[in-house]
Interface confidence: low
């Protein structure tokens, strides 16, 4: 009812709760005394249908019949208008307008945990727009019953707050939900189930990780469970892996030995429980523990590499390099490497311990035989020592790889190709390709890089540590016993014309010609590698084209003679520099003016 | 075991904001879980944040999630505490501590084997 309608009343028929797609009749009457004050057939009655007028009347009453409602609550209002005056509420009515529930659908029964509560879910059907009461009702045995009601419109979940005890772990119960409202009543199907189906375990926790004596091959998972738990299973992974191992163990007591973990890897576990083979259902899995595995001493062998460089007659340079074992092979954080030289004749060792480098750099004497043995160590020990023998790498000229040739593949990457050598190519046990950033003064600091390929190889495709515009000195050597053979070639992997030309810096006058001498282009300028410098002159004052000399490119050479100037006349002389992709701008320009007699 | 030193606690400003290191000796630091954790005058150590080894995970107290940001840097066997928006309830020492312990419950004390001596940190309203 709406207000206190002191003035009349409006009845609904048949009902203020009708089914969809029924008819109402609203009636809206006034009491005695309560219309117009002067005259009683200038009472006009009028229906609202929420604030639109949908009938009216003259007299005391008012009928109307009322069709097509929508699913929902629609509010009707009757008012009174007098002559002159505003209109005046009398009374209204809400009509609800709804279906009857659905069966319930799909109930299904859970208890979390030993210690939990029998809570139920099911699915209610359409929306019944109504005022609907659920009733849940579940049986025991000894005819025990619990009725657990819920009058939320959206009801489709109840806990009776009971909990099932695994005495009797066979026993049967039965819960069965029934909805009910103005226009009807419907029950689910019934659900049986024992305590072994509907109680699911707590996931498990306290999960921690023990690994015997700091190793990763003694190492056990333990966690706590809920008293009856029979099952677990336990999924693990590295953390930057996607794929879980998954295990299952039975009777496992809350404790699991795990046998093939990897080292110095940190891991996520989970577990979860269960407490019958075949019955009920697994826990959520528990939450996850990240531990990183001990460190196991490494495993395999360095790649290592030299180059020997020439002193004096008695001492030369070897420089020693190695790659970094892979996170498998290093199993742990790599402390130090191990650095021995040993004389083979003598029996003189020396050993070092390199840490932050991979790369040492001793001078030894030019006589004897030496031996290199370098080995990486972890805190639990270190790996099997990789060993070389010392020797002149190129000098085996039959060895020497043939017609090398280097050529840009793509960004950043050079195709290295060549033939076998002349000698026996099937005495080849592998070759090493090596390369280096070509630097003018030799540089000895200048990273190397090498690969190794298979003596069947005859081509190699280097990558690592490539810049584009940058000139490298590459090297293939074929390795045969204690003997080696070896062939070089610049390359680069794109380049363009050099940025600037070379600059002259000395005009020296030698027995008729003359001696130009020159600053290399700064690496930076040079753009790729050169192939050939260019030295042009021409008559200082003379407009005739000038003259030019090409000189091939050869790291260590910067300067060179020309004999062809004439005496008493000055020259202009200016250089260029040229790489596979063009010549560049020109460098300074010298004037100069032979001396001496022409010959 | 590590020897541990806090630094870059002071006073500052409601709304302002620090940053504090733990430096670490000992080169097994990578290995360690690492946690703050902070004692008001009159109140019992709580637990702050906490990071494992490779800085993989972390945690947050509840009140600074947010605010707070836990960092480590293996290579110079340092951990950090980078603090925002710090309220005056953020008062306290601040202790650093190392576990070798592999669980969850970085949140408990007594999983850290090792402490730092901790620095002041007031904040002003």
């Known amino acids: 009812k709406i207000d206190a309608c002191k003035r009349g009343d409006v009845t609904v028929k048949p009902s203020h709760v009708i089914l969809l797609g029924s008819t109402v009749n609203i009636t809206c009457s006034l009491k005695p005394r309560q219309g117009c004050f002067h005259y009683s057939r200038r009472n006009k009655l009028i229906l609202y249908k929420f604030d639109r007028r949908i009938n009216f009347h003259h007299g005391h009453s008012l009928n109307s019949q009322v069709t097509g409602l929508p699913l929902g609550t629609t509010l009707f209002v009757c008012k009174l208008a007098c002559i002159n005056s505003d209109e005046i509420q009398i009374c209204g009515a809400e009509i609800f307008v709804g279906v009857a529930p659905e069966q319930p659908q799909n109930l299904s029964c859970i208890q979390k945990g030993e210690q939990g509560t029998v809570a139920c879910t099911w699915e209610r059907g359409r929306d019944t727009h109504l005022y609907t009461e659920y009733t849940l009702q579940l049986s025991g045995p000894k005819n025990l019953t619990w009725q657990k009601q819920c009058k939320d419109i959206y009801c489709d979940y109840l806990d009776f707050g009971i909990n099932l005890t695994p005495e009797s772990p066979e026993s049967n119960f039965t819960a069965k939900v029934t909805a009910v409202n103005s226009l009807g009543s419907s029950s689910s199907l019934p659900s049986t189930f024992t305590f072994l189906d509907i109680v699911r375990p707590l996931p498990p926790w306290d999960i921690r990780i023990k690994f015997q004596k700091a190793s990763v091959s003694r190492c056990t998972l333990y966690w706590r469970d809920e008293g009856l738990v029979l099952l677990n299973r336990l999924r693990y992974r590295p953390s930057n892996s996607r794929l879980w191992n998954m295990v299952n163990v039975t009777k496992a007591k809350g404790r699991h030995d795990l046998l093939d973990l990897k080292p110095f890897t940190e891991y996520e576990f989970q577990i979860s429980s269960k407490l019958h083979l075949y019955k009920g259902s697994w826990s959520d899995w528990s939450e996850s523990l990240r531990a990183q595995t001990p460190e196991e001493e490494p495993t395999g062998m360095l790649d290592v590499w030299y180059m020997k460089r020439h002193i004096d007659y008695s001492r030369q340079q070897i420089s020693l390099f190695w790659k970094n074992l892979s996170v498998s092979e290093a199993r742990g954080k790599i402390l130090h490497y191990q650095v021995t030289l040993q004389e083979l004749t003598g029996g003189k060792a020396m050993t070092q311990n390199i840490t932050g480098h991979t790369s040492w750099t001793t001078v030894i004497p030019r006589t004897g035989n030496w031996a290199v043995a370098v080995s990486a160590a972890n805190s639990k020990g270190s790996s099997l020592p990789t060993r070389i023998n010392i020797m002149n790498l190129c000098e085996a000229g039959l060895l020497a790889p043939r017609q090398v040739s280097a050529n840009s593949e793509g960004m950043d990457n050079i195709l290295v190709t060549w033939q076998p050598p002349r000698k026996d190519p099937s005495a080849v046990q592998e070759y090493v390709v090596e390369w280096r950033e070509l630097h003018p003064g030799g540089d000895t600091q200048v990273p190397l890089n090498w690969l190794r390929s298979r003596p069947y190889n005859v081509s190699a495709l280097i990558s690592e540590n490539i810049k584009s515009y940058i000139c490298y000195e590459i090297r293939v050597y074929a390795l045969s016993g204690d003997q080696g053979g070896c062939s070089s070639i610049l390359g680069n992997s794109k380049h363009k014309a050099p940025l600037s030309g070379p600059h002259i810096n000395a005009i020296t006058e030698e027995k008729g010609s003359i001696l130009i001498s020159w600053n290399s282009i700064p690496v930076q300028e040079q753009m790729g590698c050169l192939l050939h410098y260019r030295i042009y002159w021409k008559e200082r004052d003379s407009n005739s084209q000038p003259q030019l000399c090409e000189i091939p490119y050869r790291v260590s050479q910067n300067s060179h003679p020309i004999n062809s100037l004439q005496p008493r006349v000055t020259y202009v002389l200016w250089m260029t520099a040229l790489t596979a992709a063009g010549e560049s701008s020109h460098g300074n320009e010298r004037e100069f003016c032979l001396q001496g007699k022409a010959n | 075991q590590v020897q541990l030193v806090e630094s870059g606690g002071g006073l500052v400003q409601a709304g302002g904001s620090l940053r504090l290191s733990c430096a670490a000796s000992g080169r097994t630091f990578s290995s360690y879980a690492m946690g703050w954790f902070r004692q008001a005058p009159g109140k019992e150590r709580e637990f702050v944040s906490a990071?494992?080894?490779?800085?993989?995970?972390?945690y947050y107290v509840e009140s600074v999630e947010g605010r707070f940001t836990i960092s480590r840097d293996n290579a110079k066997n340092t951990v950090y505490l980078q603090m925002n928006s710090l309220k005056p309830e953020d008062t306290a020492v601040y202790y650093c501590?190392?576990?070798?312990?592999?669980?969850?419950?970085?949140?408990?004390?007594?999983?850290?084997?090792?402490w730092g001596q901790g620095t002041q940190v007031t904040v002003s309203s």
């Open positions: 990071i494992s080894w490779n800085g993989g995970s972390r």
């Open positions: 501590a190392a576990s070798r312990i592999y669980t969850n419950y970085v949140a408990r004390s007594y999983e850290y084997d090792d």
